[in-house]
């Protein structure tokens, strides 16, 4: 009997995420079943499914499969975080390239080589032909996108809309085009899933048909996803187990990038005289090892042969005889020109001092091995072995311990915004340490923040001027009063935490504030039966530059018709541009008979790039910066509304996109406002729900 | 009576220093952030710097960088403003107020001082 195949190896996962669909005419199709690979090898050959599976879900707790017409880039269709859920989807509905010559391309161009938009298949105008949806079935002849269902040499193609031309190849490029590498590949995170020889690689979390040791929640920064080609062990290119039970493992024809240059988190920080961390970054002159025998050259094979080579090891300085460490061991080595003994350590080479010079991080420090133990407040970092129970509790995977050493701060769970450590205090569990990013360096650790790809669905004193008084579900606004004055907006994002701004406080004793919720007035007259007037507990400032601060009530909130919260969007989502959105407050509004009902100005998102050209050039924004224009001129926040939300909708569902700070100007016509971007720092916010203690309603 | 004081303006030639003083009376200055204001004749008043009580933060606005430093001394309740290579452009009268104060800009609250006069002219 034929052994079936295993499909599951076709798609990309994301762990412990699930799609909802907001449009009710999506179908879906559920079963239960034992295990994902069930689920996939049902999607694959579409049996018994109304549709052609796009994606599915794998529920863990209910083991079920849930089989989805759509995938992410779908319309009407969000993204869940659910621990329980695992989606998979369908790589070739989401690659925009092709594997020879593109048979199973099933990606959505639909534009000839040329340049013209080709005809719908279902359609006989302007070409009549053979190529029906319904006689190619499983080749996905949908709408009008580039398909090559016979397999044909040139790769997809397409009847053209144009009556001149009947059909043309589609500029579609070839994976192993699109894919590059610097250096070894080390860092390289691409999607190639296939071997040079054509073999299909094996999924990291698979133990057929080859056992072996990386799995990936034991190196969790080693990008090991699916069945992509990685370089884990210092390889000289990426490399996978393929599913040739013959062929162990093969390596992958990944091209070196045009600008071969280091571009990722991980750039180890360049030394010449002393060794930091491992010394993976040490670019000194030392040649000998500890003992005092000098080194071999990295390019000779005399006396020792070896492939450690400079044409192998790109990027990692193997020049001369000097010690270096290209392959992540304890330190510094070279081979030895005794050839009694073949290798040996630079362990001469001092430790950086951290004391001098200017201790820093590139990226997002995640890579950070100093020494230093402190956190920003000046509190002194608790052990990380006494706290593990707690870091398991906000990362799903299992910690490089090796980089926890001692009590120094280092950033085990990929924090955006920089190493930290916990503390020993229980009113601050955690806080981040005063380093900061080593100059010069620009890594972002947002990518790709002007493609729309993420979808944001799962917001002082500035006054909206000129806006138009509003009654309309708006629980989540909270009036920060100082000494009995309202001082600040800010949006309730769960019972026991409001968002808003730093510049909203200036006394460091709580005593002067509280927050008033559920009220329209500022002065809530009129709002008796639904106010609620809660105590500030504490204050828990954002990453450095922020000025985000997440204030704890005393005691939560009680939700109901007039108290609600506002949802955050998801990390490093984008929000198309010209999306409509609002802000809300209630300070100086521009009439002399203010009338102290909270106020809403209605403004739509603006391209950063578009932003800065208003601002006449003078200011630059950054990933952690949202631009947005008011639609009515001189209409947007002012002095008065600080903290307060810019609130957008996506999918139906309400958001705080950014939270307005000052410096930026007030209502200026043509000027749109520039608020901190709250999709660059929501994982500090959920990080900080997470851990931070409150008090129970 | 609780109030803010600020003392040290004068007139300087451009390129020189002066040292600007704001003394608190009537209350404890290390609860609060202090930030530093400047209205120039017929211009809006304009945040200048400010030192925040609530980790010791600073701010400085771009056209101060790297010639202003805001510091505090919480046992004889001051904030100094050191001014160094001065500009005729940083003539205006300064104040000190309880601020607000982030990465980007302050917001003044609360009891003003009647304003230091600096004059920067050769």
């Known amino acids: 009997q034929r052994k079936r195949r295993n499909t599951i190896h076709e798609f990309k996962k994301s762990a412990k995420t699930t799609l909802i669909k907001i449009d009710p005419a999506l179908k879906i199709k559920t079963k239960k079943v034992n295990t994902a690979d069930q689920c996939a090898n049902r999607c694959t050959r579409n049996k018994g499914l109304p549709f052609t599976c796009k994606a599915f879900v794998f529920d863990k707790a209910r083991k079920q499969c849930l089989w989805f017409p759509f995938n992410s880039m779908s319309s009407g269709v969000k993204k869940e975080f659910g621990h329980e859920f695992d989606l998979y989807e369908n790589k070739d509905y989401i690659r925009n390239c092709i594997i020879g010559k593109g048979r199973s391309y099933k990606g959505t161009v639909s534009i000839t080589k040329s340049g013209i938009k080709c005809q719908p298949w279902s359609s006989m105008i302007p070409h009549e032909h053979s190529f029906l949806p319904s006689s190619y079935r499983g080749k996905d002849l949908q709408e009008n996108y580039c398909r090559n269902p016979r397999g044909e040499e040139g790769g997809p193609w397409c009847f053209t809309s144009n009556p001149e031309v009947r059909y043309e190849v589609c500029d579609i490029p070839q994976c192993s085009e699109v894919e590059c590498m610097t250096c070894n590949g080390e860092s390289y995170r691409g999607l190639m899933d296939h071997t040079e020889s054509g073999k299909i690689c094996q999924r990291w979390d698979h133990q057929t048909p080859h056992r072996h040791k990386f799995l990936p929640e034991r190196y969790p920064d080693k990008g090991f996803d699916d069945n992509y080609c990685r370089n884990p062990d210092g390889q000289p290119r990426p490399w996978c187990y393929t599913l040739d039970p013959h062929t162990r493992w093969e390596y992958c024809a990944i091209k070196t990038c045009a600008d071969n240059t280091m571009n990722d988190t991980d750039v180890p920080l360049e030394t010449t005289e002393c060794i930091q961390g491992q010394g993976e970054g040490y670019r000194g002159t030392v040649n000998t090892i500890w003992n005092g025998i000098p080194c071999q050259r990295w390019d000779s094979q005399y006396p020792h042969e070896h492939d450690m080579t400079p044409e192998n090891f790109k990027c990692k300085d193997l020049r001369e005889n000097y010690c270096r460490n290209p392959d992540g061991s304890e330190s510094p080595w070279c081979f030895t020109t005794d050839p009694n003994i073949r290798v040996g350590y630079c362990s001469q080479i001092p430790n950086c001092d951290m004391s001098h010079g200017q201790d820093c991080y590139r990226g997002n420090g995640k890579n950070y091995m100093g020494n230093l133990s402190q956190t920003r407040s000046g509190l002194t970092c608790s052990m990380w072995d006494k706290n593990m129970e707690d870091l398991h509790r906000h990362i799903f995977w299992e910690p490089d311990a090796s980089k926890l050493n001692e009590n120094y701060c280092r950033n085990p769970d990929d924090d955006a915004h920089g190493p930290w450590c916990y503390t020993g205090n229980p009113l601050i569990p955690w806080d981040y340490c005063p380093i900061s990013r080593c100059e010069g360096d620009t890594t972002p650790t947002i990518v790709n923040l002007d493609h729309p790809v993420i979808s944001c669905a799962k917001t002082k004193q500035l006054r909206v001027v000129n806006g138009i008084p509003t009654r309309t579900n708006i629980g989540w606004m909270v009036s920060l009063r100082y000494r009995n004055k309202h001082i600040c907006g800010g949006s309730l994002i769960k019972e026991s935490w409001v968002l808003t701004a730093r510049q909203c406080f200036p006394s460091r004793d709580l005593k002067d504030y509280e927050a008033w919720l559920g009220i329209h007035d500022v002065h809530g007259r009129g709002d008796e039966k639904c106010k609620q007037v809660l105590n500030v507990s504490q204050l828990v400032y954002g990453p450095e530059g922020s000025d985000l601060v997440l204030m704890k009530l005393a005691r939560p909130a009680v939700l109901d018709d007039f108290v609600s919260t506002i949802d955050l969007p998801n990390y490093g989502c984008t929000i198309p541009e010209k999306t409509s959105c609002s802000v809300y407050g209630w300070g100086y509004t521009g009439l002399i008979n203010y009338d102290g009902l909270l106020r809403v100005a209605h403004l739509y998102i603006m391209g950063n790039e578009k932003c800065s050209q208003h601002h006449r050039g003078k200011v630059t924004l950054n990933e952690s910066e949202i631009c947005a224009g008011a639609e009515k001129i001189g209409s947007g926040p002012c002095e008065g509304d600080y903290g307060g939300p810019l609130v957008c909708e996506q999918h139906k569902m309400r958001m705080v996109l950014g939270v307005i700070v000052p410096g930026r100007g007030c209502a200026i016509p043509n000027r749109p406002g520039i608020f901190v971007r709250v999709a660059y720092y929501a994982k500090w916010i959920h990080k900080i729900i997470l851990t931070y203690k409150v008090p129970q309603s | 009576e609780v109030q803010l004081v600020e003392s040290g303006g004068g007139l300087v030639q451009p390129g020189g220093s002066l040292r600007l003083s704001c003394a608190a009376s009537?209350?404890?200055?290390?609860?609060?952030?202090i930030g530093w204001f400047r209205q120039a004749p017929g211009n809006e008043r304009e945040g200048v710097s400010c030192?925040?009580?609530?980790?010791?933060?600073?701010y400085y606005a771009d056209s101060v960088k790297g010639r202003f430093t805001i510091s505090r001394d919480n046992a004889k309740d001051t904030v100094y403003l050191q001014m160094n290579s001065l500009k005729p452009e940083d003539t205006a009268v300064y104040y000190c107020?309880?601020?607000?104060?982030?990465?980007?800009?302050?917001?003044?609250?609360?009891?003003w001082g009647q304003g230091t006069q600096v004059t920067v002219s050769s």
């Open positions: 107020a309880v601020a607000g104060c982030g990465a980007y800009g302050l917001i003044p609250y609360d009891y």
């Open positions: 009537g209350f404890t200055l290390d609860h609060y952030t």
């Open positions: 030192i925040s009580s609530l980790d010791g933060s600073t």
